[in-house]
């Protein structure tokens, strides 16, 4: 049975121009973290396995930093990155937990984070 | 140049050992992960796991059941792979083969081992 | 296991010509695909990954799409040195699996 429960950043903004980082933590589970993929829509933006590192997608390795841990630092934000990213986590026994995050990229410089929700 | 080198042909015996070798040059050996892949005579790819030298992480394919250990020498830039409890479905071509920085690609192999195991 | 089925498993096909080949993934891989080339008794040679960029060296005859669960390696206009046997794998999740592979003859 799957208990775990990925916490997420939630609902955030950010300035153009300006970074953010991504960042979820899997909680209430005893099950190992293989892997965590990150995406946006259907596109890939990186992998960051336990064992082999990280893939950064090709697309966005000039503006995505891995890190900090399992998280994404995502740079140079455009009002194009405006919408939702998922982090999927690839666990052992349980299987895959998926967490999601709305990002929206603000012209102006008043950009706040959201309060951090959690998703089952 | 990248140049990742291997040992030579073995033939081997069903329920023995077979370890490989794969010295590695051109570049800077900790900064790549190494993988390891086999071919059957006349089939396709299968991916035995690979090894992080930057911090001894190893992955294998479960189908290997603990059959496999992938193992290296950082000091000679040399990787290994053992596989025990042979049998004659082993009989393959292995290959190393080096992932690209930051990329789950893999960008440059070795020239392949012939593993025979027959009794 | 993901696994990754290749179609057609071979193709006849003449200098000049236009090949498509295609890769369905059993369950969603994004865009987490790469493309081999191997000729007899030789190592595969990385041709495409991510899975449209073309490897170091690779000629742009080659060219690669898809995302989700299809994708396709395209030979533009076939030249003598493309006869051989083409792979692909993903690696968006552990164990990589690679498709069992399209054989590339002369017609």
């Known amino acids: 049975m799957m208990t775990g429960t990925i916490e997420t950043t939630g609902n955030i903004s950010a300035e153009k121009g300006g970074s953010i980082i991504l960042q979820c933590h899997l909680s209430s589970t005893t099950a190992q973290v293989t892997q965590v993929n990150w995406e946006q829509q259907d596109q890939l933006l990186a992998i960051c396995n336990a064992d082999l590192g990280w893939h950064i997608s090709p697309s966005f390795k000039d503006r995505v930093a891995p890190g900090p841990g399992l998280g994404l630092t995502l740079q140079s934000l455009t009002v194009n990155d405006t919408g939702e990213y998922f982090c999927i986590y690839h666990t052992y026994p349980d299987g895959t937990y998926t967490g999601r995050i709305f990002l929206e990229v603000l012209e102006s410089s008043v950009a706040e984070h959201g309060a951090r929700f959690q998703i089952p | 140049e990248v140049q990742l080198v291997q040992s030579g042909a073995e033939v081997k015996k069903p329920g023995s050992s077979v370890k490989v070798s794969c010295k590695a040059s051109?570049?800077?050996?900790?900064?790549?992960?190494i993988h390891w892949v086999r071919q059957a005579p006349g089939q396709g790819l299968e991916w035995i796991g690979g090894f992080n030298p930057n911090h001894d992480g190893t992955i294998y394919n479960q189908i290997f059941r603990g059959r496999v250990t992938i193992t290296a020498d950082k000091s000679t830039s040399t990787a290994y792979m053992e596989l025990s409890s042979l049998r004659s479905e082993d009989t393959a071509v292995y290959f190393c083969?080096?992932?690209?920085?930051?990329?789950?690609?893999?960008?440059?192999w070795g020239q392949g081992t012939t593993v025979t195991v027959s009794s | 296991d993901i696994q990754m089925t290749q179609s057609p498993s071979s193709l006849s096909a003449s200098v000049g010509d236009r090949v498509t080949i295609t890769c369905k993934a059993s369950?969603?891989?994004?865009?987490?695909v790469v493309w081999y080339q191997q000729k007899p008794g030789k190592a595969p040679k990385l041709l495409i990954y991510s899975p449209s960029y073309r490897f170091t060296g690779v000629p742009s005859r080659f060219s690669g799409s898809g995302s989700g669960t299809d994708f396709t390696l395209t030979i533009s206009s076939l030249q003598p040195e493309d006869f051989a046997t083409y792979y692909c794998?993903?690696?968006?999740?552990?164990?990589?699996?690679f498709g069992g592979g399209t054989k590339v003859e002369i017609k």
């Open positions: 083969t080096r992932a690209a920085k930051l990329l789950f690609a893999m960008d440059y």
């Open positions: 051109g570049y800077t050996f900790t900064e790549h992960v």
């Open positions: 369950q969603h891989v994004s865009n987490a």
């Open positions: 794998q993903q690696h968006y999740s552990t164990p990589w699996t």
